[in-house]
Interface confidence: medium
């Protein structure tokens, strides 16, 4: 997953400690798991469990690892090349259009509807009308602020910055 980059994600730069491996940049870029030194001569490894980088880069800083919020479980820890993967706890889900928090799944469908999809970490239960079979979200859909329609991509149970 190619998760990029917020101002808060930038880890404070520290002088390379002896345990931080150094290598030379390739075409001015450093490999995943590293960032470039200020003079551009070295690639400095990220610190395991503290920060990471996921792609070839000329970042002056590795990116700070995400800490899972309360209400989330950690699926996989932060490594030097991948951010922490967090997932909503059982019974809650994270919607693509409100990714900052886990929301409780509904416990049942409205009258006249039947459940056709279970609560998952990335979707609420899915209800359809008994007769017509049309889907119902249980809420008035919010007007999405979009640029254009674009090919859809499925939600995945992963940290937003990982």
């Amino acid at each position: 997953e190619s998760a990029l980059i917020t101002q808060q994600d930038l880890a404070p730069q520290q002088r390379a400690a002896p345990q931080q491996k150094r290598s030379s940049p390739s075409e001015g870029l450093c490999p995943p798991g590293h960032h470039i030194s200020e003079d551009g001569r070295d690639c400095i490894s990220c610190k395991y469990g503290q920060d990471y980088s996921t792609h070839w880069n000329d970042l002056l800083f590795c990116l700070r690892c995400t800490r899972c919020d309360s209400g989330e479980v950690e699926l996989s820890p932060c490594t030097t090349t991948r951010n922490t993967v967090c997932q909503c706890e059982e019974g809650t889900f994270r919607e693509e259009d409100s990714p900052e928090m886990c929301r409780k799944c509904r416990t049942g469908c409205p009258r006249g509807m039947v459940k056709v999809g279970d609560c998952t970490p990335w979707s609420d239960i899915e209800c359809v009308h008994k007769e017509s079979g049309t889907k119902h979200s249980g809420e008035v859909p919010a007007v999405e602020e979009t640029v254009t329609s674009s090919p859809g991509t499925p939600a995945s149970p992963c940290s937003l910055s990982g």
Partner: nanobody, 125 residues
Framework: EVQLLESGGGEVQPGGSLRLSCAAS????????MGWFRQAPGKEREFVSA????????YYAESVKGRFTISRDNAKNTLYLQMSSLRAEDTAVYYC??????????????????WGQGTLVTVKP
Amino acid sequence: EVQLLESGGGEVQPGGSLRLSCAASGRSISNYAMGWFRQAPGKEREFVSASVWNQGGNYYAESVKGRFTISRDNAKNTLYLQMSSLRAEDTAVYYCVVARTPETPITSARGANYWGQGTLVTVKP
């Protein structure tokens, strides 16, 4: 509402160059992460490159490292992608994306960032 308009796509021979532009309107881009993704026919959308504002630097997919260069002009509210040594496998629709908030990262499959309509790049002899 944020509007993104890509331009600069077209047909080019292998080894050729193109420069894509993405003009943003509706807000200043200076404090927001921006990037480029692409989608080849019959394939999933994939990350190409991303730009961090001010000091941070840039990210590149391994497949474009050393051939593509991302840059931005905050005064013009525009993101660029200079593509050189183009290959047939670079053929795709290229999409510009900008983060929804300063705290929002740009992700490959999630995040509901703002997307442009895309510009087609075709590399063929």
